[in-house]
Interface confidence: low
């Protein structure tokens, strides 16, 4: 049985140029944890392995930063990282936790950082 | 698991500065990050910022970024949090919360009144 709550920073706004920290957690579970995966739609971000630690997939990696903890920090962002991302959370016994961020990068100077954790 | 506990909250006014601290002890071997958390009256917590223990290397929310600084102690297995050009959104419970391996979760402290007056 899955007990498990992914908490997320829920949707967030930046501006264009600058970064942003994605943030996930799974609480209430006692679970192990095998790997994350960040995913932005179908493409896969970077992986978080309990046993070979932190892998940036090659067309992210002058511009993803892992941490702070699992969470992911973007650079440099464009307009057209605007969307979802997704923390994928492999767990044994429990199986795959995921949670959603939207990310909306604006051109604006006046972007609000609505960042928050959220329970789904 | 890691024991936290925070201290240096109060009341302040816009513009004025407040440190925090938070005390670790237990399996602090164990912590990769550390990192402060916030919760405002009716709001979700949010996150302030983090410092990886060992590196040091600093992460920050934007709504932060620039007034806010995070520091640590290792000797004193203390993390801080220097907050100035405070505002009255910055009214929050702060929360100290420490990440250990490479895939724990954050283990959290009690948290901490900070209320920033107009």
């Known amino acids: 049985m899955m007990t498990g709550t992914i908490e997320t920073t829920g949707n967030i706004s930046a501006e264009k140029g600058g970064s942003i920290i994605l943030q996930c957690h799974l609480s209430s579970t006692t679970a192990q944890v095998t790997q994350v995966n960040w995913e932005q739609q179908d493409q896969l971000l970077a992986i978080c392995n309990a046993d070979l630690g932190w892998h940036i997939s090659p067309s992210f990696k002058d511009r993803v930063a892992p941490g702070p903890g699992l969470g992911l920090t973007l650079q440099s962002l464009t307009v057209n990282d605007t969307g979802e991302y997704f923390c994928i959370y492999h767990t044994y016994p429990d199986g795959t936790y995921t949670g959603r961020i939207f990310l909306e990068v604006l051109e604006s100077s006046v972007a609000e950082h609505g960042a928050r954790f959220q329970i789904p | 698991e890691v024991q936290l506990v925070e201290s240096g909250g109060g009341l302040v006014q816009a513009g004025g500065s407040l440190r925090l601290s938070c005390a670790a002890s237990?399996?602090?071997?164990?912590?990769?990050?550390m990192g402060w958390f916030r919760q405002a009256p009716g709001k979700e917590r949010e996150f302030v910022g983090a410092i990886n223990w060992l590196s040091e290397s600093t992460y920050y929310a934007d709504s932060v970024k620039g007034r806010f600084t995070i520091s640590a102690d290792n000797a004193k297995n203390t993390v801080y949090l220097q907050m100035n050009s405070l505002k009255p959104e910055d009214t929050a419970v702060y929360y100290c919360a420490a990440q250990g391996g490479v895939l724990s979760g954050w283990d959290w402290g009690q948290g901490t009144q900070v209320t920033v007056s107009s």
């Open positions: 237990g399996s602090i071997f164990s912590i990769s990050d």
